[in-house]
Interface confidence: low
């Protein structure tokens, strides 16, 4: 299709060498009128179409993206080309940074509702670089952490660098829904909530004399609680002895419950001890059974084939640990009688 | 550009408590960690603990009966009090920046932004 | 809490060589390690994260390497402002702890 009739749209990401930081794209499609995408044609000039970054409308979740390659080949979509760009309804994704995603990125919808729509669609010229100025670096990441039922403030990475006072007019995203009430380079929460978590995009307008263009950087926003001041405890095994079979295979479940820690480093094993001795069994890995903002359970099972006689005089120990300290809980096996 | 500056008294008698104020500019205090650092003459770094723009501590277990680490997010400052010192305490304290770095699926935190030290004695 | 032991404590070298420190963690500390340079009379300055990821602006001579419990940082080729004392950090769990630290001298 013929793309000199998009609209154009410039844009900057600047992306910090240190993170693993992701970008959006949104497809700025004018806003529909009625069922159709778009009557560019129609309006008169005084009737200049409000832009949705991110599109209400269910017609608009399915446009079709196309980057627009330097040698002047035909348009690629996106989906077959890029496996590092993900499109989702309207926004596209970029996964890694890197300057090979500089390029013409165009958008339009899939389905051409009226001969109008044919020229409804966006060029989006995104020019990538690493960030040159070290220093500016260490002013804002793109995680952020908020923490639940204090105040907080979530900064554009991009502007943290200026102060308040010469800051430009920034245009800020949660989710993809525009937040209009904010325009400064820091969102201030008065009090956090698990709904503050998001990805939160932030844009401002930059100038020079030849053109102008958006400085767009990108947020993930955690919220969460403070680190835990509790040893984790054992929810299963509850009972320090379990009847079982001679000869049959047996399973025992240790299942604890960890508080949120920053840095989370969980232990959870079994050993065994038999008299005087004592060593750690080799067990299956340990996996996660529910994960929460407060704490997080873990699973691990230690596995006998078939229990023997010399099972019932050992004791089956599971420890748990995290930073502030650890938890025992044994269990002692006994033969089922009848 | 974040910048951090100790400041506090470079010298405290045995037995009583040292105060520093780590007064962060350039940035805000919030969303971060900051921890304190001490490097005794000639010796290595140690962590002494960390606080959350919040009030949310995490002490080193050697100094935690001794540690107060506090913030008053208002004036951009977060504090260190070192009670019942000895000439053992004697060292440059650092103040610094727990920042988190994105990696996929996790945070993976390093201090990226320090302050330039001060020096405490402890001598009476 | 968990130790880091690097060795050499301090080494020799001249400008142009190419240096390697190593830093032994007491127990597995997957990839939670950072490396730090300190000059006299001057606060450390970050250099390396997550074992082999290189800050922003540290210049491609310095690299890191490994996982676990074995670590290295290596200098390819030694410059006369890379004198200094270097040290490891790991963040896997708390206590956050320091290796003892590498001086660095010229020969």
């Known amino acids: 299709f013929n793309i000199s009739g998009c609209s154009t749209k410039k844009l900057l990401w600047t992306y910090s060498t240190r993170s693993e930081e992701e970008f959006v794209l949104f497809c700025d499609l004018p806003e529909p009128q009625k069922s159709h995408f778009c009557h560019r044609n129609r309006l008169s000039p005084k009737q200049v179409p409000e832009h949705l970054p991110f599109m209400g409308s269910n017609d608009l979740s399915d446009v079709q993206w196309y980057q627009q390659p330097s040698n002047g080949d035909p348009l690629e979509d996106i989906r077959k080309s890029y496996p590092h760009i993900i499109q989702d309804k309207c926004t596209l994704h970029f996964l890694t940074p890197g300057v090979n995603n500089s390029g013409s990125y165009i958008c339009r919808p899939k389905m051409i509702k009226s001969p109008y729509d044919v020229a409804c669609c966006v060029k989006m010229i995104l020019e990538v670089k690493p960030q040159t100025n070290a220093s500016c670096e260490y002013s804002a990441s793109h995680k952020q952490d908020l923490l639940l039922g204090s105040t907080g403030s979530i900064s554009c990475p991009s502007l943290s660098c200026q102060s308040d006072a010469q800051s430009p007019a920034v245009t800020w995203y949660k989710n993809g829904k525009l937040l209009s009430v904010e325009r400064s380079n820091r969102i201030v929460v008065d009090e956090v909530y698990d709904y503050h978590q998001g990805t939160y995009v932030c844009d401002y307008t930059q100038s020079d004399t030849v053109s102008s263009w958006t400085v767009r950087a990108v947020v993930q926003v955690r919220t969460i609680v403070g680190d835990t001041k509790l040893k984790p405890d054992i929810l299963d095994p509850v009972e320090d002895t379990l009847e079982v079979e001679l000869g049959k295979p047996l399973t025992i479940s240790c299942k604890a419950r960890f508080g949120f820690e920053r840095v989370f480093n969980p232990v959870i094993k079994w050993y065994i001890k038999d008299s005087d001795l004592e060593w750690e069994v080799s067990v299956p890995e340990a996996k996660s059974i529910k994960s929460t903002l407060k704490d997080e359970i873990i699973e691990r099972n230690i596995i006998l084939e078939k229990v023997t006689q010399r099972d019932l005089r050992r004791k089956f120990v599971c420890f748990v640990q995290n930073s502030i300290g650890n938890t025992t809980q044994s269990v002692q096996l006994k033969e089922k009688r009848g | 550009q974040v910048q951090l500056q100790e400041s506090g008294p470079g010298l405290v008698k045995p037995s009583e408590t040292l105060s520093l104020t780590c007064t962060v500019s350039?940035?805000?205090?919030?969303?971060?960690?900051w921890s304190w650092i001490r490097q005794p003459p000639g010796k290595g770094l140690e962590w002494i603990g960390y606080?959350?723009?919040?009030?949310?501590?995490n002490y080193n277990p050697s100094l935690k009966s001794r540690v107060t680490i506090s913030v008053d997010t208002s004036k951009n400052q977060f504090s260190l009090k070192l009670s019942s010192v000895t000439a053992a305490d004697t060292a440059v304290y650092y103040c610094?920046?727990?920042?988190?770095?994105?990696?996929?699926?996790?945070?993976?935190?390093?201090?990226?932004?320090w302050g330039q030290g001060t020096t405490v004695t402890v001598s009476s | 809490a968990i130790q880091l032991t690097q060795s050499p404590s301090s080494l020799s070298a001249s400008v142009g060589d190419r240096v390697t420190i190593t830093c032994r963690a007491s127990?597995?500390?997957?990839?939670?390690l950072a490396w730090y340079q300190q000059k006299p009379g001057k606060a450390p300055k970050f250099l390396i994260y997550?074992?082999?990821s290189l800050e922003s602006g540290v210049p491609s001579r310095f690299s890191g390497s490994g996982s676990g419990t074995d670590f290295t940082l290596t200098i390819s080729s030694l410059q006369p402002e890379d004198f200094a004392t270097y040290y490891c950090?790991?963040?896997?769990?708390?206590?956050?702890?320091f290796g003892q630290g590498t001086r660095l001298e010229i020969k």
């Open positions: 610094a920046r727990d920042v988190g770095i994105a990696a996929r699926n996790s945070y993976y935190y390093v201090m990226d932004v």
């Open positions: 950090q790991q963040f896997n769990s708390y206590p956050i702890t």
């Open positions: 350039g940035g805000s205090i919030n969303n971060y960690y």
């Open positions: 606080i959350f723009y919040s009030g949310t501590t």
């Open positions: 127990q597995g500390i997957s990839s939670a």
């Open positions: 997550e074992g082999s």
